[in-house]
């Protein structure tokens, strides 16, 4: 039974040309993380996997940094970047938790943070 | 328990192709969290190659993006890694393995690729 939850960084923007933090923490389980998966639409950003650690795309290498911990650090940001991202945690004994970001990139200064959230 | 096994491997010349297949048994393919491509070459450390998650998601090592394709047939238990253009420092022994949704990985045996110039 998955009793777990995914808490992310929700919905966020940020400036062109700056850097932004992808979060997610599974929390209210005591299941073992295998595999973390970063995807952005149809791509596959960077897997941390336990054994294997970090692999990260190279169209991405660039502007995309592991961590902190099980999270993401995209760098050089351009209006291309907005869109949805998802954290999919494989786990052991519960199975596959997934969580969503929508990451804004805006032109202008007034990038603001928004509200974290869960996803059951 | 999973195992897994490399074929396909061989001699070929530069220029040339060549399918690596690896073959799971044991457990339901389709509940993999990710298949791997590594291969390691005399004297030289495990390279990182492809990755194919249990979306179909694919992620490539600089050194083989644009020339191997790694695919998965899961009604075949099989992952493939495609490699097409191979040079003599393509030659290594290829191993896959298999991370599922339990702790700890699954490795193949390996498969020797030699490429002649």
């Known amino acids: 039974m998955m009793t777990g939850t995914i808490e992310t960084t929700g919905n966020i923007s940020a400036e062109k040309g700056g850097s932004i933090i992808l979060q997610c923490h599974l929390s209210s389980t005591t299941a073992q993380v295998t595999q973390v998966n970063w995807e952005q639409q149809d791509q596959l950003l960077a897997i941390c996997n336990a054994d294997l650690g970090w692999h990260i795309s190279p169209s991405f290498k660039d502007r995309v940094a592991p961590g902190p911990g099980l999270g993401l650090t995209l760098q050089s940001l351009t209006v291309n970047d907005t869109g949805e991202y998802f954290c999919i945690y494989h786990t052991y004994p519960d199975g596959t938790y997934t969580g969503r970001i929508f990451l804004e990139v805006l032109e202008s200064s007034v990038a603001e943070h928004g509200a974290r959230f869960q996803i059951p | 328990e999973v195992q897994l096994v490399e074929s396909g491997g061989g001699l070929v010349q530069a220029g040339g192709s060549l399918r690596l297949s690896c073959a799971a048994s044991?457990?339901?393919?389709?509940?993999?969290?990710s298949m791997w491509w590594f291969r390691q070459a005399p004297g030289k450390e495990r390279e990182f190659l492809a990755?194919?998650?249990?979306?179909?998601?694919?992620l490539y090592a600089d050194s083989v993006k644009g020339r191997f394709t790694i695919s998965a047939d899961n009604a075949k238990n099989t992952v493939y890694l495609q490699m097409n253009s191979l040079k003599p420092e393509d030659t290594a022994v290829y191993y896959c393995?298999?991370?599922?949704?339990?702790?700890?990985?699954?490795w193949g045996q390996g498969t020797q690729v030699t490429v002649s110039s």
């Open positions: 990755i194919i998650t249990d979306g179909s998601k694919t």
């Open positions: 044991g457990r339901t393919f389709s509940t993999y969290a």
């Open positions: 393995a298999g991370s599922w949704s339990y702790p700890g990985l699954t």
